[in-house]
Interface confidence: low
């Protein structure tokens, strides 16, 4: 008789999750000399320890502290790029502009990017069938708590000018319920961060509106200003040209607005 198993509303743990985390760790530490000291087996053990045998609706930030400690990493605090609802372009940008970093360019962000995971209370099994959905089941699930924890730490580390890439094609360009809006914005440190600069990425080729005047951007400006951080905003009308000009800034076509 098969054992009864909790059915959650979200997709189950990503196939080959342990192997993927371990492999990503090995890959990352090979590519990044400053992280060569990291023992990937210990990282996996700490990752596993955060959610295995625990109820997947009762995960806390404390559960992830051993992993956070092992994954401690110093990135240049003035080279941080946050993003909301436009991950692919943000990652394309940091692949070209190699001295800037998204959360997923750090070890812990890289390990977990696009993965899902959860366990079961009182068993050492990983649940590959289903995991809790943030809305339909519970917010204190292993994936959500992980991203809340690493996002908070990433924002806390930022200094000087912090950039954020926002999706101008969304109805809410700035969404208070996104990780950026609910976690990162509130954990930027006013004593370290001088300015938050938003880059609003346009979707339509003929879209010449000033999306920096959008009501949700004004809302973001208000939240940031109240935290004694300056705010600035730029329209990126042509993201394709934007990336091209990051690659080749001396190109004559890159002197015009992008």
């Amino acid at each position: 008789v098969p054992r009864w198993r909790q059915q959650w509303s979200g997709p189950g743990t990503t196939k080959r999750f342990p192997e993927t985390v371990l492999a990503r760790c090995v890959k990352y530490t090979e590519i990044h000399p400053e992280m060569r000291h990291v023992d990937c087996q210990s990282v996996w053990d700490a990752f596993k320890g955060a959610f295995i045998s625990k109820h997947p609706c009762n995960i806390t930030e404390e559960d992830y502290q051993p992993l956070m400690k092992l994954g401690t990493q110093t990135v240049p605090c003035n080279k941080i790029l946050l993003w909301s609802r436009i991950k692919d372009l943000a990652h394309q940008f940091t692949q070209v502009q190699r001295d800037m970093f998204t959360l997923e360019d750090t070890l812990l962000g890289y390990l977990a990017d696009d993965l899902t995971w959860c366990g079961e209370f009182n068993t050492s099994k990983i649940n590959y069938q289903s995991c809790p959905d943030w809305r339909k089941d519970c917010s204190n699930n292993p994936v959500s708590v992980f991203w809340k924890t690493v996002s908070r730490r990433f924002a806390e580390a930022a200094c000087d000018v912090v950039h954020v890439m926002l999706n101008g094609s969304r109805s809410k360009i700035f969404d208070k319920n996104s990780t950026f809006g609910s976690v990162e914005v509130h954990n930027l440190q006013p004593e370290k961060v001088q300015t938050l600069e938003a880059w609003v990425i346009h979707g339509g080729r003929e879209d010449s509106r000033d999306l920096c005047q959008d009501p949700t951007i004004k809302e973001l400006e208000s939240i940031i200003s109240k935290r004694n951080i300056q705010f600035s905003c730029k329209n990126i009308y042509r993201p394709d040209k934007f990336l091209q000009c990051v690659k080749n800034p001396e190109d004559s076509s890159c002197t015009s607005e992008i």
Partner: antibody, heavy 123, light 110 residues
């Protein structure tokens, strides 16, 4: 002990085809990216192609694109190279080589090599 | 014409130190790790150095690798007769999306 054993080489006429195989043992085959590297008689090493651990990504040197196809069967622990429209300049010893864990491109190196199989293209 | 450039030959007397250079560009050596291989006559290549300077187990510490900018080098100290072989540098090339080798350097013992 890691072992890579190539087979399938031989004499073939220009325009002909060959399929090389590389039987792997002594390690978890589907944890590693794999490559083919060739060496023309009296010449240096030339990387030909590689394939990621799960077969999802393949890459080729420009000179064989559209002509060679790399593949793998993880259930059989075997790597393949299908070579079509062969030319005299494809004459070489073909080595199967194990890459680094899960095909790390930036740190990609060849930790273990087979003994090679000779492909001769001549009329 | 190889993407990475090595001198075709190098030589030394037993006990001497020999250095082999490998020159590339920002898309290969500049951005990625360098490996070195030894190929004894009639045999398959063998990994000597990976990740610029790491030695696999079993490789004597007489062999050392280093990298600076877009160039790398392999040093063999305390040269021995069994070191007579061809040596190849290799890196990944981001713009080509593939591995590239140097043309090889034949080391001869005088």
């Amino acid at each position: 002990e890691v072992q890579l054993l190539e087979s399938g080489g031989g004499l073939v006429q220009p325009g002909g085809s060959l399929r090389l195989s590389c039987a792997a043992s002594g390690f978890t085959f589907d944890d590693y990216g794999m490559s083919w590297v060739r060496q023309a008689p009296g010449k240096g090493l030339e990387w030909v192609s590689d394939i990621s651990w799960n077969g999802g990504k393949t890459h080729y040197v420009d000179s064989v694109k559209g002509q060679f196809t790399i593949s793998r069967d993880n259930s059989k622990n075997t790597l393949y190279l299908q070579m079509n429209s062969l030319r005299a300049e494809d004459t070489a010893v073909y080595y199967c080589a194990r890459g680094s864990l899960f095909h790390d491109s930036s740190g990609f190196y060849f930790g273990h090599w087979g003994q090679g199989t000779l492909v001769t293209v001549s009329s | 014409q190889s993407v990475l450039t090595q001198p075709p030959s190098a030589s030394g007397t037993p006990g001497q130190r020999v250095t082999i250079s490998c020159s590339g560009s920002s898309s290969n050596i500049g951005d990625n790790y360098v490996s070195w291989y030894q190929q004894l006559p009639g045999t398959a290549p063998k990994l000597l150095i990976y990740r610029d300077s790491q030695r696999p187990s079993g490789v004597p510490d007489r062999f050392s690798g280093s990298k600076s900018g877009t160039s790398a080098s392999l040093a063999i100290s305390g040269l021995r007769s069994e070191d007579e072989a061809d040596y190849y540098c290799q890196s990944y090339d981001s713009s080509l999306s593939g591995s590239v080798f140097g043309g090889g350097t034949k080391v001869e013992i005088k």
